[in-house]
Amino acid sequence: AQNITARIGEPLVLKCKGAPKKPPQRLEWKLNTGRTEAWKVLSPQGGGPWDSVARVLPNGSLFLPAVGIQDEGIFRCQAMNRNGKETKSNYRVRVYQIPGKPEIVDSASELTAGVPNKVGTCVSEGSYPAGTLSWHLDGKPLVPNEKGVSVKEQTRRHPETGLFTLQSELMVTPARGGDPRPTFSCSFSPGLPRHRALRTAPIQPRVWEPVPLEEVQLVVEPEGGAVAPGGTVTLTCEVPAQPSPQIHWMKDGVPLPLPPSPVLILPEIGPQDQGTYSCVATHSSHGPQESRAVSISIIEPGEEGPTAGSVGGSGLGTLALA
């Protein structure tokens, strides 16, 4: 089948090869599209409601005055010339619509180095097929999930027109000491080939470098974090900054389901409490700062360890904030 692409709303003429240039003609068009349930047969005689969608011209060609999404599909013509020789034409029709120029909305004027920031949301309206949005930094493509880049995408389809609206939200973590005025742009690449990408106007947010904070100290009691089963460990997060930041706790890299507190008590330690703990200090004026991680382990009876924790307690085998 010959591939034909046609712009939505434009006329389309499909030639019926081998058909005599004018009547009488022995030819038949068969269509299988979004408008048909199976194959629809159209003859030169025409007539009826289909004429407004597709009709056979005097030269045997099929004429569609304004193609739509429902006209995507297969078009076949079978014609017999004056000598009785049969010729078949076979077309695969795909339609497209170029959207308006994409735009960046909700764009940030300032980004903070070292922490994730929302740069903006790229919006493209009125495409078919959907196509894709991609982001560029200083003219080079940005790859999601690499070097602190993340992209959230959403595709919506208009219930009446069937055209697509694409949205792409860009989050980046600018490197400390990097470009103070990076240039971001977004481009729409059509779903059908042979159409050039459409690019937004660029945006140039400023990158703000936070003043390095004094380090967050994590103090473990007993030192070394090794304790006998049933023992107690106290973790204290010390942050020199004023006012005191909010302190959250992580275990094995996952935030614990707790309200903020500078102290984490691990009483009645059991096997499930072993792991790596750290605290995260969140300042209102800076990004989050994570402490070093400490490993909490259980010394089985008879083992030599750096220290042993206190034994005894309530029997409420648990770990919590104090």
Partner: antibody, heavy 118, light 109 residues
């Protein structure tokens, strides 16, 4: 053994407040958190919030911000939940539970029934 | 707010193995949701069974176990007993709050 003893049933007028208590025993009160949960008749459970009795730090469900206030008194090993501007929607049984660092709601109080009626 | 979905009711026989599940409307349940399972018996008698996805609470029989199966949290009772007839609630943590499921009424016939 661990016990959470809640205050008795309350019948209160719309627009007023009520304070429910939860006395902990059998463990070191400041080592564990106390959470509060709402259960309406024939319905499921709804999380209200959690308090760290050691530091006073709290987390509230969005729905209960401004409705519930959680406090704790270390000297009596008692946690409190105050509900304000009561309406019939606040009629329910309220539970406290001891709250583990990994969210383990191991031990529960017996529940306090609050009925809001004029 | 996220919605947590459980089977409304399940029936099993003594000695059988039964699995209750807990689905999140926001996507796959992970260890950072700290899946929690709580048992309710008549007269508002609540007991914590599983915390942190797969850790049994103190004194809970070994026949109760927690896990992640596919994109859901699961509570498995291996060799159910008549006293296990109860309502089971799961709860999932979402950054700064818990959301409970609607509960599964387990009948042991």
């Amino acid at each position: 053994q661990v016990q959470l003893q809640q205050s008795g049933a309350e019948l209160v007028r719309p627009g007023t407040s009520v304070k429910v208590s939860c006395k902990a025993s059998g463990y070191a009160f400041t080592n564990y958190l106390i959470e509060w949960v709402k259960q309406r008749p024939g319905q499921g459970l709804e999380w209200i919030g959690v308090i760290n009795p050691g530091s006073g730090g709290t987390n509230y469900s969005e729905r209960f911000k401004g409705k519930a206030t959680l406090t704790a008194d270390k000297s009596s090993s008692t946690a409190y939940m105050q509900l304000s501007s009561l309406t019939s929607d606040d009629s329910a049984v309220y539970f406290c539970a001891s709250y583990r660092y990994d969210g383990g709601m191991d031990y529960w109080g017996q529940g306090t029934s609050v009925t809001v009626s004029s | 707010q996220a919605v947590v979905t459980q089977e409304s009711a399940l029936t099993t026989s003594p000695g059988e193995t039964v699995t209750l599940t807990c689905r999140s409307s926001t996507g796959a349940v992970t260890t950072s949701n700290y899946a929690n399972w709580v048992q309710e018996k008549p007269d508002h008698l609540f007991t914590g069974l599983i915390r942190g996805t797969n850790n049994r609470a103190p004194g809970v029989p070994a026949r109760f176990s927690g896990s992640l199966i596919g994109d859901k949290a699961a509570l498995t009772i291996t060799g159910a007993q008549t006293e296990d007839e109860a309502i089971y609630f799961c709860a999932l943590w979402y950054s700064n709050h818990w959301v409970f499921g609607g509960g599964t009424k387990l009948t042991v016939l």
